[in-house]
Amino acid sequence: GSVKVLHEPSCFSDYISTSVCQWKMDHPTNCSAELRLSYQLDFMGSENHTCVPENREDSVCVCSMPIDDAVEADVYQLDLWAGQQLLWSGSFQPSKHVKPRTPGNLTVHPNISHTWLLMWTNPYPTENHLHSELTYMVNVSNDNDPEDFKVYNVTYMGPTLRLAASTLKSGASYSARVRAWAQTYNSTWSDWSPSTTWLNYYEPWEQHL
């Protein structure tokens, strides 16, 4: 039968080295065997490149395309092929569809004055446009009480958050995770970082009385 696209490709760029496109076919498809996504920068002399998609689900395909360090003017022509059949054609401007890289190395350290210091790494090198543009969201949740969670917006430059131990339940196990976004690029949120877990051993003041 004929091959059809149910949901056309949706693409995001990490604005440093990779753009990822995802789309859904109208029936289960072996993406890597049946489909190819060609991409070409709209720039004089540029070559046509081919991405071999992989299956994310039975009918969902995803393609990761290596790109050069992106700049605002970059526009790519995308063509989705099933053999000689052109299924979809469109354009993609990475700077208009940014999904930041995931923050890394989230750690929790005890700090002075009964505070926890949460630290993570900015996923971009200092020379990249996004390095100084990221703001973060930190989610802290009680592992044993789904109702006990807090969300912190970190809008200052440093990838750190100081957390008063007294704001958390004593003796409880907590997990934290962090994600990033770039306001000036009107980006989507990054994926969440892996969680890090710690025991909040702060002793409330009343117990000293």
């Epitope: 920068l41 720039f43 004089m44 002399g45 540029s46 070559e47 046509n48 490149h49 290596p66 790109i67 050069d68 700049v71 605002e72 003017a73 970059d74």
Partner: antibody
Framework: EVQLVESGGDLVKPGGSLRLSCVAS????????MTWVRQAPGKGLQWVSL????????YYADAVKGRFTISRDNAKNTLYLQMNSLRAEDTAVYYC??????????????????WGQGTLVTVSS | DIVMTQTPLSLSVSPGETASISCRSS???????????LDWYLQKPGQSPQGLIY???KRASGVPDRFSGSGSGTDFTLRISRVEANDTGVYYC?????????FGQGTKLEIK
Amino acid sequence: EVQLVESGGDLVKPGGSLRLSCVASGFTFRDYAMTWVRQAPGKGLQWVSLINGSGGKTYYADAVKGRFTISRDNAKNTLYLQMNSLRAEDTAVYYCAVDRLTKTIRPQYYGLWHWGQGTLVTVSS
Amino acid sequence: DIVMTQTPLSLSVSPGETASISCRSSQSLTYSIGYNYLDWYLQKPGQSPQGLIYLGSKRASGVPDRFSGSGSGTDFTLRISRVEANDTGVYYCMQGLQSPLGFGQGTKLEIK
């Protein structure tokens, strides 16, 4: 050492055809776009055409579009310019030049960083 | 099409002096910050052209630092300091951003 050697220039009548060749050596030919530039006697430089490294994309000046065809044989390290329906105003020295590196996603630009010695095309009855 | 305009069309300079040539484009040649697709070429009498400057300000291999390029957007300048007799020839600017590529009319530099 990078070398570009053009050949094929000749005296030809208006309406006639000619094929210029440019043999390259000293660099990885298939990785670079190549360009033809011409210079009419006593005049300035005029860009003619460009072809990317794979040969998959070509560009032309309006003055030659539909009459000239740029091509390349990467196995032979050779660039070509097929010129048809020649006119008196096509009389010029034709230079081939190495252009941008196109094997990267965004071509890396170094200008026209090496030129051949040129070949003279004369169109006259 | 992008039109390239050079001034002056001819220039006479004494050895040791500085020569300046201006090039203006009808559209911006800036693709992104630091990437101005404007080149300068020199054609000495009886020779093929040779590259001097690319991307507005980067010197081609083997070009002495007496040659410098500056500018962005639509306005660019080539400066030749401590001019020598060997610098005589015609200087061309060229835009390499989009098809059709285009050269300026050329500036003839004469050494007094």
